[in-house]
Interface confidence: medium
């Protein structure tokens, strides 16, 4: 294998999952174990992400491509990449500095992460609340209370349309 | 654990071909450069040239026009050729693996210590 | 090429001192984009391969005794015994990997006085 030479950096022979070897007048060499690049014409390789303590390996280091994180049981990502594993919580509890803590009154959240969210307000929408809400989930709003008056009819009429030209939803 | 077993004839006459072959065993046959190093007797080494498992290869100037290092990855073997020997060939002939490369700052080098050898073959040329 | 001096060719010292064998490159073997000494010793027993102590200048091998010590940069370097011990009589060489062809010392033998 003798690399052709030319009046183009030589480095940009050198293909993904080698560098450009200056000790060896710049013919391409593997990367070191543990070591990748993911483009080629590069000059060191990058060092392997290594998925430790409450990361695990999602995707395994290769000569071309970092490794891929994710967390262990009981943790999820946060951030670009997975840089962080953050604590699960159960549902119906939100992560606070002191751990994971019940949702107030008021407030629900169905999943393992993020913060508890308030119910929604029905009387916003002009609806009522069909079913109460939880700290695990939210309340079902349902139809408004006139709707709901003796005589009115149980089948909801389409609602207008917003704009002109637009069919109903 | 890695090892490296090599094997080869020992006596030669001049003009006759050297030829050597070094087995990996253990570890990772890619991703290392294997050299091959000659010692004179009572003398000091010298370095003659390098393969990797793509089969690129680096040879010491001094020797180039007459070496050849070729790879064989299905066996993870290595073998050297030298055209033409004399008696200033005649040296103990070791192979040998480089070191694994030095990561800092967020990179990666290469740096050829020689961390594993050969047990070496003594390689006599005389008429 | 890069040329590799030792000195001296030949050492004595008695069992418990320190011995020093230096060695001193022709070019600067320091590589200024990761800050590295690309120079190694060896160790080689008569009817042994040497065997490699340091690397980049002041890296002990692993299981290499912690009385072997590297140290330098640039072109001058040293290889340091702190109490000579009588497996310790060898012949030792540096070696420069900073450029090809790689290349090494002219050897030190290290004896006992």
């Known amino acids: 294998f003798e690399r052709t030479r030319s009046l183009q950096d030589p480095c940009s022979n050198c293909p993904a999952g080698t560098f450009c070897d200056n000790n060896r007048n710049q013919i391409c060499s593997p990367c070191p174990p543990n070591s990748f690049s993911s483009a080629g014409g590069q000059r060191t390789c990058d060092i392997c992400r290594q998925c430790k303590g409450v990361f695990r390996t999602r995707k395994e280091c290769s000569s071309t491509s970092n490794a891929e994180c994710d967390c262990t049981p009981g943790f999820h990502c946060l951030g670009a990449g997975c840089s962080m594993c953050e604590q699960d919580c159960k549902q119906g509890q939100e992560l606070t500095k002191k751990g994971c803590k019940d949702c107030c009154f008021g407030t629900f959240n169905d999943q393992k992460r993020g913060i508890c969210r308030p119910w929604t307000n029905c009387s916003l929408d002009g609806k009522s609340v069909l079913v109460n809400g939880t700290k695990e989930r939210d309340v079902v709003c349902g139809p408004s209370p006139a709707d709901l008056s003796p005589g009115a009819s149980s089948v909801t009429p389409p609602a207008p349309a917003r704009e002109p030209g637009h069919s109903p939803q | 654990q890695v090892q490296l077993q090599q094997w080869g004839a020992g006596l030669l006459k001049p003009s006759e071909t050297l030829s050597l072959t070094c087995t990996v065993y253990g570890g990772s046959f890619s991703g290392h450069y294997w050299s091959w190093i000659r010692q004179p007797p009572g003398k000091g080494l010298e370095w003659i040239g390098e393969?990797?498992?793509?089969?690129?290869?680096n040879y010491n100037p001094s020797l180039k026009s007459r070496v050849t290092i070729s790879v064989d990855t299905s066996k993870n073997q290595f073998s050297l050729k030298l055209n033409s020997v004399t008696a200033a060939d005649t040296a103990v002939y070791y192979c040998?693996?480089?070191?694994?490369?030095?990561?800092?700052?967020?990179?990666?080098?290469?740096?050829?210590?020689?961390?594993?050898w050969g047990q070496g073959t003594m390689v006599t040329v005389s008429s | 090429d890069i040329r590799m001096t030792q000195s001296p060719d030949s050492l004595a010292v008695s069992l418990g001192e320190r011995a020093t064998i230096n060695c001193k490159s022709s070019?600067?073997?320091?590589?200024?984009?990761?800050?590295?000494?690309?120079l190694a010793w060896y160790q080689q027993k008569p009817g042994q391969p040497p065997k490699l102590l340091i690397y980049w200048a002041s890296t002990r091998e692993s299981g290499v005794p912690d009385r072997f010590s590297g140290s330098g940069s640039g072109t001058d370097f040293t290889l340091t015994i702190s109490s000579l011990q009588a497996e310790d009589v060898a012949v030792y060489y540096c070696q420069q990997y900073y450029s090809t062809p790689w290349t090494f010392g002219q050897g030190t033998k290290v004896e006992i006085k």
């Open positions: 040998a693996r480089g070191l694994l490369g030095e990561c800092s700052g967020g990179s990666c080098y290469y740096g050829d210590a020689f961390d594993i």
């Open positions: 070019q600067s073997v320091l590589y200024s984009s990761n800050n590295k000494n690309y």
């Open positions: 393969v990797i498992h793509s089969g690129t290869t």
